[in-house]
Structure formats: C-alpha cells, structure tokens
C-alpha cells in the first residue's frame, strides 16, 4: 500500500516542492483530522500558513467557542483556521507570526511576532508573543501578557463587560484592549468612530476598521 | 452615525476661563463614558477628565484638580469642560472621546487611551501671557 503525504504546515508544502500559493490538505502527525487552509507561497520566502483573513465582509466572525475551535469560513476567502489545529501545531515546534494589514487609503502595514503559540482548550486557547517588530507599531496592539480567547459564548476576558458580545468576534480580550481583528467588517467611508470594528490601535488608533487583515504563521526555522 | 463635535475653545488670557462643549450624536451618553484630551505642540494626548454614570463618576488628571469642571447634560446629549484659572500651559487642542461606559477592567475605575474609539476633531485652546 503507498504511503500517504500528508503535510503539517504549509512549510512543509513548500518544501515539497510545491510552491503555488492556494489551499492545500494539512494534516497534524498522529492525527487523522485535516484542515484546508490557504498557503501563501510568496510573501517573505513563503511557506506561510494563513490562519485568518478579512477582506470584504463576506464572511460572519460573531461565531461560538466550538465554531473558532474548529475554524469557518472560506480558506480561497474570508476564514479562521481554527484554535484547535493552530494550539497544536504551534506546540509542537516553534512558529512565528506574521499579522499582515490593509487600510482604506491604500496603506499596509505588519507585525512579526518571533515566538507564538496557543495554549490548550483547557486553557482557552490563551495566546503566548514574543519579541514584536514590524511597521504596525512599536507596541504590540494584542494585550501583553496574552490573554484568554473569548466568544460570544464564552466569556473570559478581564471586562466587567463582555468584550467579544460589545465588540463582535472571537478574540483574546483584554478589557477589551488594543485590537480585534476579528470585527465588525465597515466599508470605507463608514470605517471611522467605530465601537466594534477591525481594530488594530498601534497602527490606525482608535475607531479605525481596517480594509483587510491576514494572520499567518510559519516554523521559526524555516 | 457616531460623532463627537467640540467647541468653546479660543484664545484667552492667563487666568481667564473658558467652558468647552461636546456635543454627541449617534448614541446616548447614559450607557458611554466621555473623556477629554488635549494635544499639545509636539506633545502626546494626555487625560484631562472624564466622566460617566450620569456624572456619578468623574476623574480628573493631577494637573487640572481644583481648576477644571466636567459635567454633562444627558437631555441635550452634551458634556461640558469648564476651565478656570487658565495657564499657558494649557494651550493645546482639547479633544472630547467616547467609549461604552462597561468597557472596564475589573477593580479600575477609568478607561486606557486606546480603549475610547470616537474622537471629535478638537478645538483649539490658546492661553496667553
């Protein structure tokens, strides 16, 4: 019988030779389960693993803890890959992450984290950064120390609020802290003075909804 | 839509005193806090006051106690600045911002910078010499 390839990342994909940015097949190691998710073989050297990405709208973020465990939407599109392949994937080896933005007037922006990864369910998919650098700010616009997820099901964030019900999305909330990529998605010219928009603040400041995000994530040593 | 409209700033004297106002539209001031701001030449925004609750909580920074009053009129949806004993250290834009008044972390009383997401566009505020 011939051995199955399966990939865990979309380094490996890379490095397999094929190199053509799209969505491919990932599957963890010992694990049956696989994920689609968009690989963007270009930006930076490539083998980039695309865990997020807003970009018109199309797609509903207000979703619940079970749906942002298991990922939505549309890898081609609008989608979250989900906390529960990422948690595992980011502790098995080291990864890095890249928050890739867009704003209305035509500007882009990143943040590059040298160190990520996503604690357990147990733990609420809890996010752990280190060491930020990148054009999107000199202050990291996600809370540090990293704090819990939260959706609108789920409530763990250190609001006497409920951040991810206040400000639309699954998100690791502060009370509720300097972004939300995970927003209410504004057209432009209703971008400005927003209360739940895509917010990143070290960047754009305050009320800002940005044009287009993507969150994407890459073995350190590659 | 959500605006913030300030006014009442010009250019005043040394000791003189000056009632700012913003103006709010969009939403209703019983479920938001507002703050104001100002921004001087070259300088970051920094806090002046704040308040929510009706008035039942207001705060204000070390610089301007005893000096500044905040208040608000929730029937015409208006906060106020009143700024006596002006200095010429107080020259700067003053900014009115909003953000929902639950947005608190536990056991703290007040709302970090990035935290107010609608800003008016300022008035400006001159204290001479």
């Known amino acids: 019988k011939e051995e199955q390839i399966s990939f865990r990342d979309c380094a490996e994909v890379f490095k397999s030779g094929h190199t053509t940015n799209g969505v491919y097949t990932l599957t963890l190691p010992n694990s049956t389960e696989e994920v689609k998710a968009y690989c963007d073989m270009e930006a930076g050297g490539g083998g980039w693993t695309i865990i997020q990405r807003r970009e018109d709208g199309s797609v509903d973020f207000q979703r619940t803890w079970k749906e942002y465990k298991v990922g939505f939407g549309n890898p081609s599109g609008e989608y979250w890959l989900g906390n529960e392949f990422v948690s595992q994937l980011t502790n098995q080896q080291r990864y890095v992450l890249k928050i890739h933005l867009k704003d209305w007037e035509g500007n882009e922006a990143y943040s590059l984290y040298e160190h990520f990864y996503l604690s357990s369910e147990e733990l609420n998919y809890r996010i752990h950064l280190k060491g930020l650098t990148g054009t999107a700010g000199k202050i990291s616009s996600i809370s540090q120390p990293g704090n819990d997820f939260s959706t609108k099901d789920a409530d763990n964030d250190k609001c006497i609020c409920k951040c991810s019900q206040m400000l639309t999305g699954g998100w690791w909330f502060d009370a509720c802290g300097p972004s939300n990529l995970n927003g209410m998605y504004y057209p432009q010219r209703q971008n400005t003075n927003k209360f739940n928009g895509i917010k990143w603040y070290y960047w754009k400041g305050s009320g800002y909804s940005l044009k287009g995000t993507t969150m994407m994530i890459r073995p350190a040593d590659f | 839509e959500v605006q913030l409209v300030e006014s009442g700033g010009g250019l005043v004297q040394a000791g003189g005193s000056l009632r700012l106002s913003c103006a709010a539209s969009?939403?209703?001031?019983?479920?938001?806090?507002i703050g104001w701001f100002r921004q001087a030449p070259g300088k970051e925004r920094e806090g002046v006051s704040s308040?929510?609750?009706?008035?039942?909580?207001?705060y204000y920074a070390d610089s301007v106690k005893g000096r500044f009053t905040i208040s608000s009129d929730n029937d015409k949806n208006t906060v106020y600045l009143q700024m006596n004993s002006l200095k010429p250290e107080d020259t700067a834009v003053y900014y009115c911002?909003?953000?929902?008044?639950?947005?608190?972390?536990?056991?703290?009383?007040?709302?970090?910078?990035?935290?107010?997401?609608?800003w008016g566009q300022g008035t400006l505020v001159t204290v001479s010499s």
């Open positions: 911002a909003a953000v929902p008044a639950g947005r608190l972390r536990f056991g703290e009383q007040w709302y970090p910078l990035y935290e107010y997401d609608a």
């Open positions: 969009g939403f209703t001031l019983d479920d938001y806090a």
């Open positions: 308040i929510r609750d009706n008035g039942g909580s207001t």
